[in-house]
């Protein structure tokens, strides 16, 4: 209609990156700028993703360089972490959120993918860091080693082969295990701290050089008592797990203080793993009864957790897998290990601002049912498995819904801002839920709609639409972009229109009847008003028409509703040659060029397109007789 | 040669206060657990204190508890027994005594005592 | 706390007698019992440590045993200077807390 088509600017960017797969208009201080997603470019050796920042009218784009964001902390894995998957502007203070949620970070043996976003201020700097999923892991653990090294240890380097064995299966690195160790006789000596060393090569190499000190006298005591008040002190972390491993081969000589230095262990929850190496009571013929009480005293309850024993210094070697697999079967301490929580669970596959913070899709929470949560100035409001049930029933969990697919938010009169998100596997067919989140991590679901074609992906593409910018919603559309029709995937987008509290189905929009496959409703945009009518409008995109060139359909809004026939269908052929996927994104929000009038930004594939708007003549014709 | 040697005693009246000393010599205090017996007169043997000079837990008898402190200066090799609010009940020859790992943790060297007379 | 008692509380026997002192814990301890010996006027002298062990410089008539939560100290044949008073002495695991019997007078027949 009043798009003009012959002189878009079509802004290039790398294909291989899929440049284009997001954009959203931004404005600095009067600046009009494009904020483009590349999920799949590539920083360094490893295909992070991005986020452009495009000038309007010419120049080239320039990387925000976001995929050199770090966590500390954490032992992240960046690799396809797909940033700029979705983006998402707050237009109160022009800042934006560019989302990874494929980011992920190792936990003991595991990769675990939280996801995390990325805060934007409005002059593109990067302000911080959203991942309302990461938990600590359960590998975050420092480690104390209270080694004897009297002169009754011997040989010394069966003892080293222990540790640098034991050393070997920890996971040590940010966020996980820290490991010091201490050597005692008749005094204690820090080896090395427990921030010494941040990988399991450096303190293999650091152990490889710790020498036996010797001494005549076993302050197994003092030891225990070093380790908890000093060891467990420098470098050691707020709520990590305290760990001690200790190993010696004879009773102490002060052990009337083991009563109180295992209390005072115990107070400090220092979970205590004890070796009784019977090499010396065994060259001499000693009972080890005693000892070996003393030991189990050492070691936490329960002693067949905790205890170990070895016939000598050599047979050290022979515990090493057990005493790592019970250390870390800690990992599973109160966990269902055949079920995930948050661990898998990609936030920011979708993400939407609202007044008081952001919503982020979790298509990969809960064993990939899924869950939206909230991050917001005050902390995070993350809803229990169980707030879901009354939508996503017990007997479904393993269907794989991916609810926060998708999320955005509706205004009703009634209730006030109510969040919506869709679910587009649910029971095959897709689902869409409107509900309010507590901060007792309940949920009110409201409503919820139901797809009507198994695989039609309905829900995967959720808009509101206030068509008459009375700040409350009028219309949702709910794009179920894989719906099959007349052999193709022609996708549909549904109409629902609110009436008092409900959204009440009203039929779909209407595409062109091509036969190729289409994926209408791939993207669907709420946009200002594009035809100066002062009604609101939507613009849907079916990246796959034309041979996967890719088209946009204009639909005008009216009177508190949507008119069901598109007013422009706008083609990639017709704006540039080789264009692809052209529809995959949409964003409409600025007039980008000055002349009063919004303008369009389209995603394509390796490229960003922006579309001007021109004005509408009304022409009001009137007839005048005269003579009357 | 290993000996104990206790001073400090003598009489107090009730409610008073009492420093004993155990000066120690022929072992280092340092690495070793001082105990302080006492027996009444006519009686038997009572535990009351124990310290571990290097790490300085103590542990005392329930009928001395918020009263007595035993304490230790290893620079001087000496143990001491600061006696508080003292009680007629508590008139005995107190005794220090080594505390020994080599003795599987038995009392084996002991002092010759020093009186103390709780009298009004 | 564990008590220790300590029968009988006084004995009358000759020299050269066997002579049988008992101490019974309250409950079941670590063998870390002592036996002393103490003369009118001394300071108390160890015989017996580690229930079993002979202190070095005793003489060897002074025995000592375990059985379960009794503990025994046996003089195997009574001298003139073994007539004193016998005390058992317990030792909590980990702890200084320590325990004494009430004491066993060995007197001349």
């Known amino acids: 209609f009043n798009m003009d088509t012959r002189k878009p600017r079509v802004i290039p960017g790398s294909r291989t990156a899929f440049f284009g797969y997001t954009v959203q208009q931004h404005d600095i201080s009067g600046n009009k700028w494009l904020v483009v997603g590349a999920p799949l470019e590539t920083n360094g050796y490893q295909k992070t993703g991005d986020v452009y920042k495009c000038p309007v009218i010419h120049g080239n784009c320039t990387k925000l360089n976001l995929g050199r964001v770090t966590l500390s902390n954490v032992s992240e894995r960046k690799d396809n972490m797909r940033l700029g998957l979705s983006l998402a502007t707050n237009p109160k203070d022009n800042s934006f959120l560019a989302c990874s949620p494929l980011w992920s970070h190792e936990c003991g043996s595991s990769y675990y993918t939280t996801g995390m976003c990325s805060r934007v201020n409005s002059n593109f700097r990067f302000s911080k860091t959203v991942a309302p999923a990461l938990q600590r892991c359960q590998t975050y653990m420092d480690i104390v080693i209270v080694l004897d090294g009297s002169n009754s240890i011997y040989p010394w380097v069966e003892v080293q082969h222990f540790l640098i064995n034991i050393l070997k299966k920890f996971y040590i690195g940010p966020g996980q295990i820290q490991v010091g160790v201490v050597q005692y006789g008749e005094d204690v000596v820090h080896e090395f701290h427990l921030n010494d060393y941040r990988s399991v090569k450096d303190v293999v190499e650091a152990a490889s050089h710790i020498e036996q000190r010797g001494g005549t006298e076993t302050r197994t005591a003092f030891g225990i008592e070093f380790a908890r008040s000093e060891a467990f002190q420098k470098g050691g972390r707020k709520g990590a797990k305290k760990v001690m491993i200790v190993i010696t081969d004879g009773e102490s000589h002060d052990s009337p203080d083991l009563e109180k230095v295992i209390q005072q262990s115990e107070r400090d929850n220092v979970t205590r793993y004890a070796v009784a190496v019977l090499g010396y009571y065994n060259r001499r013929g000693i009972n080890p009864e005693t000892f070996l009480n003393e030991i189990k005293y050492i070691a936490s309850d329960p002693d067949d957790k905790h205890f170990f024993n070895v016939t000598d210094e050599a047979a050290l070697k022979d515990i090493v897998d057990a005493l790592g697999d019970r250390i870390f079967s800690l990992e599973g301490t109160n966990k269902n290990e055949t079920s995930f929580g948050l661990e898998m669970s990609q936030t920011g596959f979708s993400s939407h601002v609202v007044e008081d913070g952001v919503l982020l899709g979790a298509v990969g929470a809960y064993d990939w049912n899924g869950a939206v949560l909230k991050e917001t100035s005050a902390g995070k409001v993350i809803p229990l498995r169980e707030s879901y049930l009354k939508e996503f029933p017990e007997e479904l969990k393993n269907h794989g819904a991916y609810l926060g697919y998708t999320v955005t938010s509706v205004v009703s009169s009634r209730q006030g801002r109510v969040y919506v998100a869709g679910a587009p596997r649910f029971n095959h067919t897709g689902k869409v839920i409107l509900f309010t989140m507590h901060n007792n991590r309940s949920l009110t679901i409201h409503q919820a709609m139901r797809g009507q074609q198994i695989g039609s992906y309905f829900g995967s593409e959720i808009t509101s639409v206030d068509i008459d910018g009375d700040g409350v919603t009028d219309v949702l559309l709910v794009g179920a972009p894989m719906y099959f029709n007349e052999g193709r995937e022609r996708g549909k987008v549904y109409v629902y229109e609110l009436r008092q509290n409900l959204f009440v189905y009203n039929g779909t929009l209407k595409d062109s009847h091509s036969y190729q496959n289409a994926r209408f409703g791939s993207s669907i945009a709420s946009v200002r008003d594009l035809n100066q009518d002062s009604y609101n409008d939507v613009v849907v995109g079916a990246p796959l028409e034309d041979n996967h060139a890719g088209a946009i359909y204009i639909f005008h809004g009216f009177r508190g509703s949507i008119l069901k026939t598109p007013k422009q269908r706008i083609t990639a052929s017709e704006l540039a040659t080789g264009l692809q996927y052209f529809g995959c994104s949409i964003h409409g929000q600025l007039d980008l060029n000055e002349d009063g009038l919004i303008d369009l930004a389209v995603g394509a594939l390796g490229n960003a397109v922006i579309l001007w708007s021109r004005p509408v003549v009304q022409i009001n014709a009137s007839l005048h007789f005269e003579p009357s | 040669e290993v000996q104990l040697v206790e001073s400090g005693g003598g009489l107090v009246q009730p409610g008073g206060s009492l420093r004993l000393s155990c000066a120690a010599s022929?072992?280092?205090?340092?690495?070793?657990?001082i105990h302080w017996v006492r027996q009444a007169p006519g009686k038997g043997l009572e535990w009351v204190a124990s310290?571990?000079?290097?790490?300085?837990?103590?542990y005392y008898a329930d009928s001395v508890k918020g009263r007595f402190t035993i304490s230790a200066d290893t620079s001087k090799n000496t143990a001491y027994l600061q006696m508080n609010s003292l009680r007629a009940e508590d008139t005995a020859v107190y005794y220090c005594?080594?505390?020994?790992?080599?003795?599987?943790?038995?009392?084996?060297?002991w002092g010759q005592g020093t009186l103390v007379t709780v009298s009004s | 706390d564990i008590q220790m008692t300590q029968s009988p509380s006084s004995l009358s026997a000759s020299v050269g007698d066997r002579v049988t002192i008992t101490c019974r814990a309250s409950?079941?301890?670590?063998?870390?019992v002592a036996w002393y010996q103490q003369k009118p006027g001394k300071a108390p002298k160890l015989l017996i440590y580690s229930a079993s062990s002979l202190y070095s410089g005793v003489p060897s008539r002074f025995s000592g045993s375990r059985s379960g939560t009794d503990f025994t100290l046996t003089i195997s044949s009574l001298q003139p200077e073994d007539f004193a008073t016998y005390y058992c002495q317990q030792s909590a695991p980990y702890s200084s807390l320590i325990t004494f019997g009430q004491g066993t007078k060995v007197e001349i027949k």
């Open positions: 022929g072992f280092n205090l340092y690495s070793s657990y």
């Open positions: 310290i571990s000079s290097y790490s300085s837990y103590t």
């Open positions: 005594a080594r505390y020994s790992y080599y003795s599987a943790w038995a009392l084996d060297y």
């Open positions: 409950q079941s301890v670590s063998s870390a």
